[in-house]
């Protein structure tokens, strides 16, 4: 029954991890706009992987596409690819745990099998959740230095009283989406490879004792007994409920309350 | 096609207070900024804040600060903007003007003079 | 605040010749993540209010003649009106469409000689 729920849940919390994977990858607010000098921006910008996007405070907003593969930074380059990595692997793994849930019967296949197939998947989970985290990290690391080299020269003299403010990018929410995500998935992972040792079937193999009763023989032959009694081959109505992300993206915000500027 | 009505003229005294009305149509109202820009006589254009109507929020110009008051009221598709503790200086033709792409402004209403005189 | 200082004060020139507004503001108006200037022109006939001509700096509003153009980038920015008709007697003003609070130019006056 353990291994049953730990599997199971082991399968819920990476299925969430990805489906917030894949969220992070797809938002366009890995960098926004510093505000910390200016909380109310007419003019507020947000960068993401794959497009950068200006929201004017009269609502109007507009993105444009890297359009390009030659002309961007190497670094950002990497953190896609660590994201679509984390991405692929962690669909693979969905697909290979599907099989190897314990309460789904495919055929006749071996406990050992699922065993194996449980700790494939746990790897790939494992695998792609540290490529999730890498690819956030390494893109809030770039933020961190990029921030404090504009911020030491934060406004450039033209011409003595003219002044040029130079936009800074903060930390953005698809960073901390990306960040609990590939936490979830790690941590699925590591519940499947823990519910692996459980289904990987024991290889002490019990003799048959017959007992002689007076008047006729019964033969008691002990078998194996599994933890999960219950959870084998009868799947009837029973439903497998799989968890999933949403995020809300390109949420059109306003100047708060009473703002004076 | 668009439309943005205003009230009619005022005098008032200094110290009162006043509030101008402006009436939007042919548009979706509360998708919309409605920003209030006013003009002394012979003077340029000065901004004194925005509204949303769609949730009510403001973004006022300091120089009001505590002095203006912006409400939106969507049954009527009408925004208002409300100046207080008058003084000589407020004498001017006020615009509601609504807010477009490009942080421009697009149509204007027709202006209401207010007069602050003693 | 951002200062936009405009020039000439007035303006006269004579019916189809090229007109020329300068606007200077005290701060870069170029957005880095479009690389557009928020600046934007208005022109007001007497006893009118205002009327967009110009916002993103060169964008002309729809309906706007296309012989009034704009030009310009960072904290320098001009309005061209290629060949002056009557009509285009008014006051320009431009605007400072990127920080808060939104400020204008004091207007120039543009008369027929």
């Known amino acids: 029954m353990a291994v049953t729920a730990c599997q199971g849940l082991g399968f819920v919390v990476s299925l969430i991890g990805i489906a917030g994977i894949i969220a992070a990858t797809c938002m366009d607010q890995w960098s926004t706009q510093d505000l910390y000098n200016n909380p109310v921006t007419a003019v507020f910008n947000y960068q993401g992987l794959w497009r950068s996007c200006v929201r004017e405070s009269s609502g109007f907003t507009e993105c444009r596409g890297y359009f390009t593969l030659l002309g961007l930074p190497a670094m950002l380059q990497a953190v896609r690819a660590l994201m679509i990595v984390g991405i692929v692997l962690g669909a693979i793994g969905l697909l290979v745990s599907i099989f190897a849930l314990k309460c789904i019967r495919i055929g006749s296949m071996e406990d050992s099998a699922k065993a194996n197939m449980t700790l494939t998947s746990g790897i790939m989970f494992i695998v792609s959740g540290l490529c999730a985290i890498a690819g956030v990290s390494v893109f809030a690391n770039m933020l961190v230095t990029n921030f404090w080299m504009s911020t030491a020269n934060m406004y450039t003299g033209m011409g003595g009283m003219v002044q040029t403010v130079q936009t800074r990018y903060t930390f953005g929410a698809a960073l901390f989406v990306g960040w609990v995500a590939g936490g979830l998935t790690l941590i699925g992972g590591v519940m499947m490879c823990i519910a692996c040792r459980g289904l990987a079937p024991e290889e002490t193999n019990y003799k048959a004792v017959s007992y002689h009763a007076s008047g006729h023989s019964v033969a008691y032959k002990p078998g194996g007994f599994k933890a999960s009694t219950g959870f084998g081959s009868n799947t009837k109505n029973k439903k497998i409920y799989d968890g999933g992300a949403r995020t809300e993206d390109e949420v059109q915000s306003y100047p708060s309350k009473h703002d004076y500027v | 096609q668009v439309q943005l009505v205003q009230s009619g003229a005022e005098v008032k005294k200094p110290g009162a207070s006043v509030k101008v009305s402006c009436k939007a149509s042919?548009?979706?109202?509360?998708?919309?900024?409605m920003n209030w820009v006013r003009q002394a006589p012979g003077q340029g254009l000065e901004w004194i804040g925005q509204i949303y109507p769609g949730n009510g929020d403001t973004t006022y110009n300091g120089k009001f600060k505590g002095r203006v008051t912006m409400t939106a009221d969507k049954s009527t598709s009408t925004v208002y903007m409300e100046l207080s503790s008058l003084r000589s200086e407020d004498t001017a033709v006020y615009y509601c003007?609504?807010?477009?792409?490009?942080?421009?402004?697009?149509?204007w209403g027709q202006g209401t003079l207010v007069t602050v005189s003693s | 605040d951002i200062v936009m200082t405009q020039s000439p004060d007035s303006l006269a020139v004579s019916l189809g010749e090229r007109a020329t507004i300068s606007c200077k503001s005290s701060q870069s108006l170029l957005n880095s993540g479009n690389q557009k200037n928020y600046l934007t022109w208005y022109q007001q006939k007497p006893g009118q209010p205002p009327k967009l001509l110009i916002y993103w700096a060169s964008t002309r509003e729809s309906g706007v003649p296309d012989r009034f153009s704009g030009s310009g980038s960072g904290i320098d920015f001009t309005l061209t009106i290629s060949s002056v008709q009557a009509e285009d007697v008014a006051v320009y003003y431009c605007?400072?469409?990127?920080?808060?609070?939104?400020?204008f130019g004091q207007g120039t006056k543009l008369e027929i000689k």
């Open positions: 605007q400072n469409a990127y920080s808060y609070p939104f400020t």
């Open positions: 042919g548009y979706a109202f509360s998708s919309y900024w």
């Open positions: 003007a609504r807010f477009v792409k490009g942080n421009a402004m697009d149509y």
